[in-house]
Structure formats: structure tokens, C-alpha cells
């Protein structure tokens, strides 16, 4: 663990230690002012009480002020996202300084010791804040703070630190180790600024997380369940280059986070749309796509300032590339038995149709089973926006296409071995738009004909808009 | 290494203001968060709120505001609070502590009476 | 505010024995939870941060485990100076909270 008394060490210890000859020193913090989206241009570096190189450099006190602070390196050098970031901001906000903080020096050392070294960086962020404050029409409102990985801690302790509240504070997949389940002034919280988003790319249960996995914001937003990324997998990172590693996948998840949030700036007309949810598996049932009283939010930058008595979790599945929007649905699908099946595990799958483009086949994931005379719930999703949805087509995988589907059918066989008629009724889909709220009916396009089995298909039609049918008399209860 | 030293005990009449301090030695005292804590005789601990030297920032239990101020002075590394209209129920040690992991290190104590 | 309970005000043991102590939040703290032992007459003193780490010179007979509402805090082999109340705090928002203590007497 860190030492107690953290980077500044114990009053014995400063005073103790031999200070470095103060010879043509680099500082170990630098605030470099980014005039231009051209990473090779090196812009201008603001130094603490002294205002020439604000009025040189052009640094607009009205405008909106950016922070960018990286994390822990390995290499000692700014990483590409950092160019991409930077790129992106001045793309979307031409008047706005966009500072990045380089602490490489201090953040190129072992892990325990860039994390050590997190609350003197962020002091000295706050100090520059502070000396921003003093100049005419400067507002810390209008300040944001953007941190990766170690940086985000670093933005934490900036804002715990700074005379006032900085405005907005995002962390971009904060770090885990030495920070998961510290004290609330020693990590990235609430009380940092006004508003605190965070998206987590790299949590782990098991193993070691990179990523904080606890909430640290006030919305914390959990894309893909904040675990395993698309496009991530050590097959997608072998594809893509020479020598693909762990250390690539891991890299390829942690880094998600950042282009999530450069997406957000660049793709302003393809929001991302995350959903509140007590958990990544009652999300992954689909239960969780409602937006009524601010259960839904907008992802990254475009994320609307929500400042709850408690913190929200929020989830939502994306794309494996920039634009990383996807279209959620919500299927209710209520399955009638009229045989006694014992435990069935069928696999199902779904098309789309709709006015604008049809969806690939999805599978239906099945989270813990199907339960029988009852109301299944399932979330899909697909890349491309379909338009308002007409017909669906409900598919039974048939003949077994995998070992553990086979082990499946020999396994139901086995607990009903006189029961070769595996069938079950489907009358009607209920479905909900996460992005649009809207709800549609679907119902069988030949009722005589609801049941299926495997092999076989059915096909159901719009049938209504909304959920009620005109023979229902019980209401449909508001998912949370 | 790191020590708090509490101002000493005080017997105080009901409706009366009291000011508690607590000097910090030993470590850099404007980065670090100073809790309060109350202790009541034969009862739990409290916590009433904290400050942040450096900034002056404040954080309070909602129960104790209104009753409790927090002050710091970093030219002489001394934070302090301030009880007003006070009541046996104020009656308690209080505590200081200061904050890294947990509430690291803790003052010695400074116990307040209220009685008439 | 978040509730931290300690459901044994007291708790009686032998020199030698092993004993837990047991602490639950009335929501989800994740690991940000720290013990603190009181001895009579005395300032409470940090034992355990964030669940299970040892905070500096803490013996390590003493022991915390637990994650998000249920956290328990153990002495290995109760030594005679352990005589002491146990507190746990949540810190993982403000307002902090702490549990109503548990008092550890040796027989």
C-alpha cells in the first residue's frame, strides 16, 4: 500500500530529504496549452504566475477550459488517444483551451509510485486553478476536468484540492489497484466537482482489475457491463497487428474508455444512450430501458448533469468501432407450455425487419432460463438503426450446431426421454425502443399457427402501438 | 511523525460558545482533511464533519449544522471548531483526526461539560 | 445516510481464541470500509482501510474481510491488550458513518 501521508511524505521527510540542485530542473508538472489540433505543434506552456504566456498563447478567460491528464506510462511519452483527444475538443469546441497536464515524469515509475505521486499532481493543478481564479471573467464553472486511468484519481484530487468547485469532472475508466475501496478524499468521488461522469471499460471481478469497478461519480456508466469490449478480444487484437499480446487486449479495454468519450464529441449526431440499472445482469435481461425521471443519459461528453442523492449505475452495449452507437430493444416474450417439458433450454433467435434496414439474426441471450407460462424479458440490440420496426421472425436453433448445444438436447432428452414433441406457444412480442421509448405490439402473423420447435420459425407482425391489447384489463407494470 | 494536540477541557454554561483547537505536526497540514468526531460517555462515535485547510472547504453531518464551525489557520497549523448554544447534550469528548486512508491519527481528546 | 450496524454490542473471548466481529451497511459501500479499535481511556486508533488492508504497524492477527453491505473484522489470537471497543466506519461517502461499536472483553 502507499505510504501513509502519500506523495509529500511525512514533515520529517521533506525536510530531510536533499533537495535536487534547482539547475535548468524540468519541472515535473507541466501545463501545456494546445493552439492547435496538429499533434506535432507543441503549443504553449503555462507557468504558474506569470500571465505573459496566457496573453501570447491566446488563452480565452470566458471560454471553456479542458484539463487532460493521462495516467501511469510505460513508455514516458504522450500515447496517440492523447492526440485524438486533444483533436477532438478543439473540433467541437473551437474557442476552448484545452491544457494538457504532463506529469510523465512523475507518472513513468512503478505503479505504487505514479500512484503515490497522484495528490502532488493534483495539488498543482489545483494551484494553477487557483491562479486562473484571480484573473478577471476566469470561472472554475467552466472548467473540465478529463482523466484516464491514474489521471482521473489525479482529477479527483484537483478538484478535492482547488479554493472552489471545478465544474465537470470525467474519468475515463479510473484506475483500480491501490484506489478500489479507498477512502472518498483519496480517489475520484462526487465531491470533486460539480458534476462527475465516469465510464468503466476494464472491471474485473476476478483477476486484477485495471479499472475502479465501484461507482466513483455521480452517473458511473458501465459500456458492455464495463468488462469484456468489443473488439477487444485477443482474436480481434491478433487481426489487427503484428504481435497481438495480453498486454494488448488489456490496453485495447482500458483505452475503450477514451474513445468512447471521442466519439461522443466527434459523432454528435450518433449519441450513445446509457440505461440505469442496479446490475450489469438485470441490464443484460433487458429490464433495464427505461428513461422515465432520468434513468437514461447520454454518454461522454453530451452526458446531461445529474447530481442524484445516490449514485447511478448506468449500462449500455456498444459497437467494437467509432461510431460506437448501437439501437437497444427491450423483448417481453410471453412462452406457453401445454406439455409438461421439464427444464428447457431452447436457443433463440430474432430478425428485425424494419422501414429503414432489416437487423442481422441475434441471438436471444438467455441469462438464467426460460421460465414457462410466463413473461420472458431479453435485451437485443443492433448497429444499424432500423427505422420503426414491422414484422420480426422468431427462430429455434434446430439441429444442434454446437457441443454444448448437443449436450444441451442430450441433457433435456435425458430428463424427458418420452417427450420427442419439444414445443412451445408464442402468441405475441412486446417490444421497446431504448433509444426512441417507443413500445409495439407484435402478434403471430397466423394465430391458428403460435407454436414452435426446434428447427422452425415463427413470424409475428405490428400489431399495436403500445402494449395494451384491447382484451388486457391488467395494466403493463412500469419497468424500473 | 504525525501528532495532534488538542486544546484542554472545558466546563461551559448552557447557551454559552466554546472553541475547541487542534494543532497538527508532522505532516503538510493544508492537504489533508481534519475530522471531528463526538463521543458521548459510554456512547459511540460521531462524526460532526471535517475541513480542508488549504481551501478552507467544509464538509458537515447534517445533524451538526448550525452547531458546529470549522476553522483553520495554516500559518500556525491549528484547525478548530466551534460549538455554539450549547446544552448537556454537547456534553462529549471531541476528537480530531486527520484523514488519508482512514482517519489515521486521532487528537488525544478535549472534553466539554456543559453544566449550569 | 448510510446505516453501519454492529449487531453485538459485546463480545466475550479467551487469550488465544479466535473472534469476528461483523458489520452491515444498509447499502452498497463496495470496499470502503475501515475498523478502528478504541481501548478505555484512549483515542481510537486505525487497524484496517478499505476492507482488508493493515494500515502501518498494525499486527497482522488482525484481519478484515468483506465487500459490499457485509464486512467482518478478526482477531486471530486475542492477545490480552486487545481488551478494546471495535468500530467500523463506512468512508465511502459523506456523511461518514460509523457502526455502534463492539466491546471485546477478555474472560
Known amino acids: 500500500s502507499p505510504t501513509p501521508f502519500g506523495p509529500e511524505g511525512q514533515l520529517e521527510d521533506e525536510l530531510h530529504k536533499p533537495k535536487a540542485i534547482q539547475t535548468e530542473v524540468k519541472p515535473s508538472v507541466r501545463f501545456n496549452l494546445r493552439t492547435s489540433k496538429d499533434p506535432e505543434h507543441e503549443g504553449c506552456y503555462l507557468s504558474l504566475g506569470h500571465s505573459q504566456p496566457l496573453e501570447d498563447c491566446g488563452f480565452n478567460m470566458t471560454a471553456k477550459t479542458f484539463f487532460i491528464i493521462h495516467g501511469w506510462t510505460m513508455s514516458g511519452i504522450f500515447e496517440n488517444w492523447l492526440h485524438k483527444l486533444v483533436s477532438a475538443l478543439h473540433t467541437r469546441e473551437k474557442d476552448a483551451n484545452v491544457v494538457v497536464v504532463d506529469w510523465l515524469p512523475l507518472a513513468h515509475q512503478l505503479y505504487t509510485d505514479a500512484v503515490n505521486n497522484t495528490r502532488v499532481v493534483g495539488h498543482s493543478i489545483a494551484r494553477m486553478l487557483d491562479w486562473l481564479q484571480e484573473k478577471d471573467d476566469f470561472s472554475l464553472e467552466n472548467v473540465h476536468l478529463i482523466g484516464y486511468s491514474l489521471g482521473a484519481h489525479v482529477a479527483g484530487y484537483a478538484g478535492n484540492f482547488v479554493k472552489g468547485t471545478v465544474g465537470r469532472i470525467t474519468g475515463l475508466d479510473p484506475a483500480g489497484p491501490m484506489f478500489e475501496g479507498a477512502d472518498i478524499h483519496k480517489r475520484l468521488s462526487p465531491d470533486d466537482a460539480d458534476f462527475v461522469d465516469v465510464l468503466h471499460t476494464y472491471t474485473r471481478s476476478f483477476g486484477l482489475s485495471i479499472g475502479i469497478q465501484m461507482p466513483v461519480g455521480h452517473i458511473d456508466i458501465y459500456p458492455n457491463g464495463g468488462d469484456f469490449q468489443p473488439g477487444c478480444g485477443l482474436n480481434d487484437v491478433l487481426g489487427s497487428m503484428a504481435y497481438g499480446t495480453i498486454t494488448e487486449v488489456v490496453k485495447c479495454e482500458h483505452e475503450r474508455a477514451v474513445h468512447l468519450f471521442v466519439d461522443s464529441l466527434v459523432n454528435q449526431d450518433k449519441p450513445s444512450f446509457a440505461f440505469q440499472c442496479t446490475d450489469s445482469n438485470r441490464f443484460k435481461k433487458g429490464i433495464c430501458l427505461s428513461c422515465r425521471k432520468n434513468r437514461c443519459n447520454s454518454i461522454g461528453y453530451n452526458a446531461k448533469k445529474m447530481r442524484n442523492k445516490r449514485n447511478s449505475k448506468m449500462y449500455l452495449k456498444t459497437r467494437a468501432g467509432m461510431p460506437f452507437r448501437v439501437y437497444h430493444y427491450q423483448m417481453k416474450i410471453h412462452v406457453f407450455s401445454y406439455k409438461n417439458m421439464g427444464e428447457i433450454e431452447p436457443t433463440f433467435y430474432v430478425t428485425l425487419y424494419g422501414t429503414n434496414a432489416d437487423s442481422q439474426t441475434l441471438p436471444l441471450e438467455i441469462v438464467e432460463r426460460i421460465e414457462q407460462n410466463a413473461t420472458n424479458t431479453f435485451l437485443v440490440y443492433t448497429e444499424e438503426d432500423l427505422g420503426d420496426l414491422l414484422k420480426i421472425q422468431l427462430t429455434w436453433e434446430g439441429a444442434s450446431q454446437s457441443w454444448y448445444n448437443l449436450w444441451k438436447e442430450l441433457r433435456s432428452y435425458l430428463s424427458q426421454p418420452h417427450n420427442p414433441g419439444r414445443e412451445l406457444n408464442i402468441r405475441r412480442i412486446r417490444v421497446k425502443s431504448g433509444e426512441t421509448q417507443r413500445k409495439l405490439t407484435f402478434c403471430a402473423e397466423d394465430p391458428e399457427n403460435t407454436s414452435i420447435s426446434p428447427g422452425r420459425e415463427l413470424w409475428f407482425r405490428k400489431c399495436r402501438d403500445g402494449w395494451r391489447m384491447k382484451n388486457e384489463t391488467s395494466p403493463t407494470v412500469e419497468l424500473p | 511523525q504525525v501528532q495532534l494536540q488538542q486544546s484542554g477541557a472545558e466546563l461551559m454554561k448552557p447557551g454559552a460558545s466554546v472553541k475547541i483547537s487542534c494543532k497538527a505536526t508532522?505532516?503538510?497540514?493544508?492537504?489533508?482533511?481534519i475530522a471531528w468526531v463526538k463521543q458521548r460517555p459510554g456512547h459511540g462515535l460521531e462524526w460532526i464533519g471535517e475541513?480542508?485547510?488549504?481551501?478552507?472547504?467544509?464538509k458537515y453531518n447534517k445533524k451538526f449544522k448550525g452547531k458546529a464551525t470549522f476553522t483553520a489557520d495554516t500559518s500556525s497549523n491549528t484547525a478548530y471548531m466551534q460549538l455554539s448554544s450549547l446544552t448537556s447534550e454537547d456534553s462529549a469528548v471531541y476528537y480530531c483526526a486527520v484523514y488519508d486512508y482512514g482517519a489515521d491519527y486521532w487528537g488525544q481528546g478535549t472534553s466539554v461539560t456543559v453544566s449550569s | 445516510d448510510i446505516v453501519m450496524t454492529q449487531s453485538h454490542k459485546f463480545m466475550s473471548t479467551s487469550v488465544g481464541d479466535r473472534v469476528s466481529i461483523t458489520c452491515k451497511a444498509s447499502?452498497?459501500?463496495?470496499?470502503?470500509v475501515a475498523w478502528y479499535q478504541q481501548k478505555p481511556g484512549q483515542s481510537p486508533k486505525l487497524l484496517i482501510y478499505?476492507?482488508?488492508y493493515r494500515f502501518t504497524g498494525v499486527p497482522d492477527r488482525f484481519t478484515g474481510s468483506g465487500a459490499g453491505t457485509e464486512f467482518t473484522f478478526t482477531i486471530n489470537s486475542v492477545q490480552a491488550e486487545d481488551l478494546a471497543v471495535y468500530y467500523c466506519?463506512?468512508?465511502?461517502?459523506?456523511?461518514?458513518?460509523f457502526g455502534g461499536g463492539t466491546k471485546l472483553e477478555i474472560k
Open positions: 447499502q452498497d459501500v463496495y470496499t470502503a
Open positions: 508532522g505532516y503538510t497540514f493544508s492537504t489533508y482533511w
Open positions: 478499505s476492507a482488508s
Open positions: 475541513i480542508l485547510p488549504g481551501s478552507a472547504k467544509t
Open positions: 466506519q463506512q468512508h465511502y461517502s459523506i456523511p461518514r458513518t
